[in-house]
């Protein structure tokens, strides 16, 4: 079934309460415009944002009978001429008579007649109508023939994009059959279709078709009021393409529209080939979009690649939410033109600072005021990390200007980084030289403490991403943060007693649930000694508060429980509810305190792994005193397992060479051999590839390496990812390796389709990557030797 037939069927369903063969139509209030009711329009009770009233009429082909409900009688079938009367197109019938067309459409043959309604003739320009009436045998006959096709074509045969030769000089009739059930012929809407005749079919249309001989290019070249657009099209080498065959829609800005542009903006764009071409192409659709087919907001891809939203408000057409079309449906032989009174500027033609919306004006105003805007050169590439207006508190805004400038510099990157370029673990450098970390979660992307909101855009010289909060790069390690805050003095002392201080000092990615001193309220010094006395128990308890990976509270999908494995080995349950982070259902007192090696969430209760039993009465008594939110299991005699700390050292091994090795020819018998065994290192990170976050597992096996040289004092392998310098480079003799990444798709950490759409806000269509597809990484120097 065609779209028209589907909508008609829906109208019939809506009208069946009124009797057989009754269709429900919706008429826009204050107009004569009627539409068969689609499901969407029926439930909205509106078309083009205007209220509608429901009318019940006989479905096409049926008629009422005196004293009977509905439309039980079928309309009489007649020849095309007679059918014009049946459908009420009496003016067209009269003109067919006087122009001597009557005998043709009463006789043999098969015709499709697109018959203008009586109202359509009334709306025709009076001079044109008079001209037709003054020359009925030629002009009027030609005009009517141009509404006819030499075979019967029902709406199901009127396919979208079809061009049918009319009976006047084979001039084309452009057919469009839209998903909302609207069928147009040269942009005139079929308002009553499929009235079968013995020698064809009649479709009533809402306007008189005017003859089309020109292309869009011809029209632009002839219209003085489009000279600016024409000149811009010439500059962008686009004018000729608008003379070629096609089904284009051109939203042509008038000269007045160009006058509305700030002169500086126009001068910049017109001086930039890429931007001016983008600007021009943004006004062109590769599909023919008649105004009559627009019954609600819809998004269309332009020739430039970005989309525009075309909507309607009553009789007006809006583009991107602004009423701007002042002349509709200028039909040409290769498309339709709508004249608009504003120039549409795509993001790709805008400077990065111009991409900011109403919600980021505080940021852009500050960037301008503090002299940072001038550093965003038109030919450079930047990324703005723009916090929303309400991220700027009064305290921030009243700061010393130099300090404020430093804060703003943290929100401008030296390079253009699009949304799809971001991946977990990525380090971004700001124009102020600060390094920012990227964290990618299931439904969020965060940079340091702040997470993105929808609205990322890419412009001519950069990209913009919108953030909930001001980005605050971390300055201190987890350990230093705890040390400078008196609230954590007890936890810190226990941490040190458990020999875990180093873990929170060295580089890494951790999430720490830090209990305040309130969590230890009532603990006596004897009980403290008891806890410290069992190192395994203490380590188990403390390491249950630590999770590998940085998990920012704002990055969690609201209301959903996230299960993380702690360093101790048991699971911890996190949930974001109303801007509050729940840790094992306990409310976090403060969250997202960023550090150089992780993030701290503050809790005022001690956490304990529910699956681990206690075997010591005294310890159980102490833990029950501190921990109320769970029932701790008691299994007499059970002990806490020792946690091998080596597992949690950073994967990157640093080799320190004490005393430079002397590389020279080794004589036999002089060789000192030391074998370094390397364990496989598995590194996981998430990268967004083609718009899809993919978890990448890099398995790097360190091979045994024999290092020779009589002068080596000793080699110490130490954990920690610091710089190893030239010594190491010499040492490894510039070994080059290839990294092969296994892309493991389809696991629970990936975004769902809907979430991708939500997160990537329709940027580029996401491409799925098949599981286990091998992606060859770049050649790189590796400290681990050859990777597998």
């Amino acid at each position: 079934n065609s779209y028209y037939d589907k909508v008609l069927a829906h109208s019939r369903i809506r009208g069946r309460d009124q009797g057989p063969n009754v269709c429900a139509l919706q008429q826009i209030l204050g107009t004569k415009k009627k539409y068969f009711s689609s499901c969407k329009n029926w439930y909205q009770g509106a078309i083009c944002g205007k209220k509608t009233t429901v009318l019940y009429e006989c479905c096409p082909g049926y008629m009422r009978m005196e004293g009977m409900k509905g439309c039980p009688a079928v309309m009489p079938i007649d020849h095309v001429y007679g059918t014009l009367g049946i459908v009420g197109a009496t003016t067209t019938q009269h003109y067919s008579d006087v122009s001597k067309l009557r005998e043709e459409i009463e006789g043999k043959g098969s015709y499709t007649y697109f018959a203008p309604s009586n109202e359509a003739w009334e709306n025709l320009d009076s001079d044109i109508r008079r001209g037709l009436e003054n020359n009925v045998n030629v002009e009027l006959l030609n005009a009517l023939h141009s509404h006819m096709v030499n075979k019967r074509m029902l709406t199901k045969d009127l396919k979208h994009g079809m061009v049918i030769p009319s009976m006047y000089n084979n001039l084309g009739l452009f057919i469009n059959h839209y998903p909302n059930g609207v069928v147009t012929v040269n942009c005139a809407r079929v308002i009553h279709g499929n009235q079968i005749a013995t020698n064809g079919v009649v479709h009533v249309i809402d306007r008189v078709l005017t003859q089309i001989g020109t292309s869009i290019q011809d029209f632009l070249e002839a219209e003085d009021d489009l000279s600016s657009f024409r000149a811009a099209a010439i500059t962008s080498d686009l004018l000729e393409s608008l003379g070629r065959d096609g089904h284009f829609t051109l939203f042509a800005p008038t000269n007045e529209a160009f006058e509305k542009l700030p002169r500086g903006v126009l001068e910049r764009i017109m001086g930039d080939k890429v931007a001016s071409e983008a600007l021009m192409k943004y006004h062109i659709l590769n599909t023919l979009q008649c105004s009559e087919a627009i019954t609600g907001g819809a998004v269309f891809e332009t020739m430039e690649g970005n989309t525009i939203e075309i909507g309607c408000e009553g009789d007006s057409i809006s583009i991107n939410g602004i009423k701007m079309v002042n002349k509709k449906d200028i039909v040409t032989k290769n498309g339709v033109i709508h004249l608009i009174d504003e120039v549409l500027i795509p993001d790709s033609a805008k400077q990065v600072i111009e991409l900011a919306g109403k919600q980021q004006t505080t940021f852009t105003d500050l960037v301008a005021q503090l002299g940072l805007a001038s550093s965003l050169k038109p030919d450079g590439e930047y990324t703005l990390l723009a916090p929303v207006n309400n991220a700027f508190s009064d305290d921030t805004l009243s700061m010393d200007q130099r300090l404020l400038k430093l804060i703003l510099q943290n929100h401008i990157l030296k390079v253009k980084v699009g949304l799809s370029d971001l991946y977990n673990g990525q380090i971004l450098e700001t124009i102020g030289g600060k390094q920012l970390r990227v964290f990618v979660y299931r439904t969020a992307i965060c940079i340091e403490n702040s997470c993105m909101v929808r609205g990322s855009k890419q412009g001519r010289n950069g990209a913009i991403h919108i953030f909930r909060e001001i980005i605050q790069p971390a300055e201190k390690s987890l350990h230093d943060k705890l040390r400078q805050d008196k609230r954590f003095s007890i936890f810190l002392s226990l941490l040190e007693a458990a020999d875990l201080k180093d873990l929170l000092t060295q580089p890494g990615d951790w999430t720490l649930f830090a209990p305040t001193n309130d969590a230890f309220k009532g603990m006596t010094s004897e009980e403290r000694e008891l806890l410290i006395g069992d190192k395994n128990a203490l380590q188990n308890i403390i390491l249950y508060h630590l999770t590998p990976g940085v998990y920012i509270g704002k990055g969690f999908e609201p209301g959903v429980t996230n299960i993380l494995k702690t360093t101790q080995g048991s699971k911890i349950y996190l949930k974001g509810v109303n801007e509050t982070l729940l840790v094992n259902e306990l409310k976090s007192k403060e969250s997202d305190i960023m550090t150089t090696n992780g993030v701290i969430h503050v809790v005022d209760k001690l956490l304990y792994p529910a699956d681990i039993p206690v075997g010591n009465d005294q310890l159980l008594e102490l833990l029950n005193k501190l921990i109320k939110y769970i029932q701790i299991k008691f299994v007499r005699g059970s002990t806490f397992k020792e946690i091998p700390m080596t597992v949690y050292r950073p994967a990157m091994t640093k080799i320190q060479i004490e005393g430079d090795p002397d590389f020279r020819l080794i004589k036999e018998g002089e060789t000192v051999t030391e074998v370094i065994h390397g364990e496989p290192v598995i590194k996981k990170y998430t990268k967004i590839i083609d718009g899809v976050p993919v978890e990448i597992t890099e398995k790097q096996t360190r091979e045994e390496r024999i290092i020779t040289g009589p002068e080596i004092k000793y080699t110490r392998i130490s954990t920690g990812g610091g710089e190893t310098g030239e010594t190491l480079q010499k040492f490894l003799q510039k070994e080059v390796s290839k990294v092969t990444k296994f892309i493991e798709g389809g696991d629970g950490h990936l975004f769902e389709d809907e979430e991708i759409k939500r997160l990537l806000q329709g940027d580029t269509p996401a491409k799925k990557i098949p599981a286990n597809k091998r992606v060859q990484g770049p050649r790189r120097r590796s400290r681990e030797g050859r990777s597998q």
């Epitope: 003085d224 009021d225 000279s227 657009f229 160009f258 006058e259 500086g264 910049r268 001086g271 038109p378």
Partner: antibody
Framework: QVQLVQSGAEVKKPGASVKVSCKAS????????ISWVRQAPGQGLEWMGW????????NYAQKLQGRVTMTTDTSTSTAYMELRSLRSDDTAVYYC???????????WGQGTLVTVSS | QSVLTQSSSASGTPGQTVTVSCSGS????????VNWYQQLPGTAPKLLIY???QRPSGVPDRFSGSKSGTSASLAISGLQSADEADYYC???????????FGSGTKVTVL
């Protein structure tokens, strides 16, 4: 063909005002703007400002803001430029030019010499 | 004092190529397009090149424009005696919000 015809030469005293006219023909007047450019004797060109013939919107050079007024009369397809509080350094040939913005100053008037002298 | 800097004169013999240069800053040429005007002695200026390299209809293809960074140039090939004129570059200046012209270059055909 497109033509811009300007009014004749003027001699003015310092402190006085001058109003130069520019009559357009050969195109749709309201579809284009008009810019005014002046050239002091033996000197280069200086842009004074622009007016939309469609709606009368103006954009004046900062230097002349407050002293210059540009207007149009669509019924006669004529643009006007009035300069007040004339000084001797305002002595110049004043040109009007059709300005469609995308193609700036594509047709020029023949120029009007304004001499400011006491 | 013009915002855009042009060499005061340039010359060549008939048939030669002469290049006129125009130097600006990031707020004018660096950010915006450059247009060129020809002013024959005793006449009004005439648009020669717009949008860096576009010739209006009627301008011979012996005239060509280009722009790079904060500089622009106009090349006149196959120099003719009729090309003897003053040539002005012009651009919009973002910082002044004004259309600025160069000081002009007098081209002489020897």
């Amino acid at each position: 063909q497109v033509q811009l015809v300007q009014s004749g030469a003027e001699v003015k005293k310092p402190g006085a005002s001058v109003k130069v006219s520019c009559k357009a023909s050969g195109y749709t007047f309201t579809s284009y703007g008009i810019s005014w450019v002046r050239q002091a004797p033996g000197q280069g060109l200086e842009w004074m400002g622009w007016i939309s013939a469609y709606n009368g919107n103006t954009n004046y050079a900062q230097k002349l803001q407050g002293r210059v007024t540009m207007t149009t009369d669509t019924s006669t397809s004529t643009a006007y430029m009035e300069l007040r509080s004339l000084r001797s350094d305002d002595t110049a040939v004043y040109y009007c030019a059709r300005d469609m913005l995308v193609v700036p100053f594509d047709y020029w008037g023949q120029g009007t010499l304004v001499t400011v002298s006491s | 004092q013009s915002v855009l800097t042009q060499s005061s004169s340039a010359s060549g013999t008939p048939g030669q190529t002469v290049t006129v240069s125009c130097s600006g800053s990031s707020s004018d040429i660096g950010s915006n397009r450059v247009n060129w005007y020809q002013q024959l002695p005793g006449t009004a200026p005439k648009l020669l090149i717009y949008s860096n390299d576009q010739r209006p209809s009627g301008v011979p293809d012996r005239f060509s424009g280009s722009k790079s960074g904060t500089s622009a140039s106009l090349a006149i090939s196959g120099l003719q005696s009729a090309d003897e004129a003053d040539y002005y570059c012009a651009a919009w200046d973002d910082s002044l919000s004004t259309y600025v012209f160069g000081s002009g270059t007098k081209v002489t055909v020897l």
